[in-house]
Interface confidence: low
């Protein structure tokens, strides 16, 4: 499944690296029952596989070459040896669809499972009286999600299989030649340009990878992570693990851990500073979720955390799952709040690049005009936000997102519940009472959190006058966790938000930025503003006060300057 | 396969405590996540508290964070539901379910557990 992957993305000198030993804290790796502990041929450990598990359902997959089985349950199989199973059966009533696990040394239904080393559940039929049966195994991970039909996959005929091969490996060679070629001579071009590039690296400054115009850059990094462009966006099937070693524990969330960690280079002693989030082998679908986000190279873009790669880790006591991203210094933008002061030029790019993060994230296209699937975050607060060496924010965690895919019922949307942090919560989140019918509604709810941001950062700038220490919003409200009954209290009940000081109208600017925040977070998500329009707001700031051209902290747009209010 | 059994209810005055046990049979049972349900007189069936299968992860309904918690012994293949400031409205048949599936969002959602308690009655007077 896609082992070879990485060969072609990462640098050459990290995919000759072989399997070295990271270096985990005993608190982080989890222990395995010994009963659990099963080794393959290799003498390798073996772990439990993980295999859609719904039992008997009834099912309307009929006539077709493949079919999802639908079954939301993906379960820890209880034994390393057992398989994933799928069982199709039709008789004159109805069709049911069956999904387990199961040990293949013994039979299910009758039958050995002949075919539990596969990667794919490819239906074989089996004669049933007064029944259509079709039984598959397979061996990867919720492979039986996938059933296959397909008389293409069907292997009964070996003399036509090797026609087959034969046929199309004579047709394929002249195109394969020539797809070599173009690897083999981007590789060179793509070595011999990093090499060129390295020296600007280690000064840190912004590099860009220039895509399809001068207005169209893909940014690959900001100032601080040294990350090379090569490795973007992947999942890491590769059984050679990147050269990683912890190094602190720098952040702890609901799901998983998040360490400071060294990707080593070569040989040398050079090394690239990378953020590494482990989930434990029970946070599987977290994990999931995040890496099906970052899996998506149209999500690229500054204000979003650069994504690396995504590694199952087997470690002697248990699995990990992990995510590797970029590291930025300056933590998260609550802590930045808490600890620092900020200018009014500070919050013009602070607010501003969290707009266009968000605005991005929202997005059915790239800046570029490619198709993109919308997502909204469902999490967005202080503390899911990274600031970057320039000063600008980049959304991470993304273990709550959406993607607003067109193929959603409506009864998908409600099953993904109320989510989030409650501090944080739209008053439709904390009333259940969001209108699923419109995918737009996700987005006004994460547009809402994002007011609440852009309050915690104007709060603390010392543009305003007098700055008082870092509060939440609903700080002095509500305690440090509240739960959504008391957010209901102040959100719904006393339609209660932050206060916006008098003086801090004083400023025009902040002003601005005050008249944007409070149309954000709007009781009625329909009156909120897009992220989109937010973004361009703070533009239209930015020109402001180019054309004013003073200094940052001042009074300075002019009393006529108006903006573009349109949502 | 999990066989659930359930002790430890009755009948308790408001503010009183209680504590429920959920007793399985079957070997691996730490890879089963086990949540309580609580389900009134005339009403649905609702999530109270879920913990995954090492006990890493909790997580409690909004109506009794603070009162009750949930933890769980693997060594002895139970897990127990400590029930404080019982109030009223804690009156209900409380169950415990088993899943093999992972943690994550679907915690309060009965329908992805497949074995269940017997149930065991808690009355709040």
């Known amino acids: 499944m896609g082992r070879g992957l990485l060969r072609g993305l990462w640098p050459l000198h990290i995919v000759l690296w072989t399997r070295i030993a990271s270096t985990i804290p005993p608190h982080v790796q989890k222990s395995v029952n010994n009963d659990m502990i099963v080794t393959d041929n290799n003498g390798a450990v073996k772990f439990p596989q993980l295999c859609k598990f719904c039992d008997v359902r009834f099912s309307t997959c009929d006539n077709q070459k493949s079919c999802m089985s639908n079954c939301s349950i993906t379960s820890i199989c209880e034994k390393p040896q057992e398989v994933c199973v799928a069982v199709w059966r039709k008789n004159d009533e109805n069709i049911t669809l069956e999904t387990v696990c199961h040990d293949p040394k013994l039979p299910y239904h009758d039958f050995i499972l002949e075919d539990a080393a596969s990667p794919k559940c490819i239906m074989k039929e089996k004669k049933k009286p007064g029944e259509t049966f079709f039984m598959c195994s397979c061996s990867s991970d919720e492979c039986n999600d996938n059933i296959i039909f397909s008389e293409e996959y069907n292997t009964s005929n070996p003399d036509l299989l090797l026609v087959i091969f034969q046929v199309t490996g004579i047709s394929l060679l002249p195109p394969l030649g020539v797809a070599i070629s173009v690897i083999i001579i981007f590789y060179c071009y793509r070595v011999n340009r990093q090499q060129k590039l390295s020296s600007t690296w280690e000064t840190g400054k912004t590099r860009k990878l220039m895509e399809f115009s001068e207005h169209c850059a893909i940014i690959l990094e900001d100032d601080r992570s040294d990350i090379s462009s090569t490795c973007a966006n992947n999942i890491n099937h590769n059984t050679e693990l990147l050269p990683i070693e912890l190094d602190t524990l720098v952040g702890k969330g609901r799901f998983a851990e998040v360490y400071k960690a060294k990707l080593k280079q070569n040989t040398s002693e050079q090394f690239e500073t990378v953020a590494v989030k482990i989930f434990p082998y029970e946070e599987y679908a977290s994990w999931k979720t995040e890496k099906d986000i970052f899996s998506d190279i149209n999500l690229k873009h500054e204000n979003i955390l650069q994504f690396l790669t995504a590694e199952e880790r087997k470690t002697e006591l248990g699995k990990q799952y992990w995510l590797i991203t970029a590291f930025h210094a300056k933590g998260n933008l609550q802590e930045y709040l808490t600890r620092h002061v900020i200018s009014w030029e500070d919050l013009r790019k602070l607010g501003s690049s969290l707009a266009r993060g968000i605005a991005h994230l929202h997005s059915d296209h790239t800046p570029c005009g490619r198709p993109k699937m919308p997502i909204v975050h469902r999490d967005l607060k202080s503390s899911n936000i990274l600031v970057k060496n320039d000063l600008t924010c980049c959304l991470c965690d993304f273990g709550l997102s959406l993607r607003l895919d067109p193929t959603l019922s409506v009864d998908d949307l409600a099953n993904s519940g109320q989510v989030g942090t409650a501090r944080y919560m739209a008053p439709e989140v904390l009333e259940s009472r969001m209108n699923l019918e419109n995918v737009e509604s996700f987005k006004q709810t994460d547009v809402y959190s994002m007011a609440l941001v852009l309050w915690e950062m104007t709060s603390r700038c010392n543009a305003v006058g007098e700055v008082k220490d870092y509060e939440p919003p609903f700080g002095s409200k509500v305690r440090e966790h509240p739960c959504v009954e008391s957010m209901k209290d102040n959100v719904l009940r006393d339609r209660g938000r932050p206060e916006i000081p008098s003086f801090w109208l004083n400023h025009q600017g902040i002003q601005m930025v005050c008249e944007t925040l409070t149309e954000c977070w709007d009781h009625d998500p329909e009156a909120r503003l897009t992220a989109q329009c937010v973004a361009e707001r703070f533009s239209e700031l930015e020109h402001l006060d180019r054309l004013s051209g003073r200094s940052c902290s001042e009074e300075k747009i002019p009393e006529d300057g108006s903006l573009n209010t349109t949502k | 396969q999990v066989q659930l059994q359930q002790s430890g209810g009755g009948l308790v005055q408001a503010g009183g405590s209680l504590r429920l046990a959920c007793a399985a049979s079957?070997?691996?049972?730490?890879?089963?996540?086990i949540t309580w349900f609580r389900q009134a007189p005339g009403k649905e069936r609702e999530f109270v508290a879920a913990?995954?299968?090492?006990?890493?992860?909790?997580n409690y309904a909004d109506s009794v964070k603070g009162r009750f918690t949930i933890s769980r012994d693997n060594a002895k293949n139970m897990v127990y539901l400590q029930l404080n400031s019982l109030k009223p409205d804690d009156t209900a048949v409380y169950y415990c379910?088993?899943?093999?599936?992972?943690?994550?969002?679907?915690?309060?959602?009965?329908?992805?557990?497949?074995?269940w308690g017997q149930g065991t009655q808690v009355t709040v007077s």
């Open positions: 379910a088993a899943t093999r599936a992972y943690s994550g969002y679907y915690g309060e959602n009965p329908t992805r557990y497949a074995y």
């Open positions: 079957g070997r691996s049972f730490s890879i089963y996540g």
């Open positions: 913990i995954t299968g090492s006990g890493l992860t909790t």
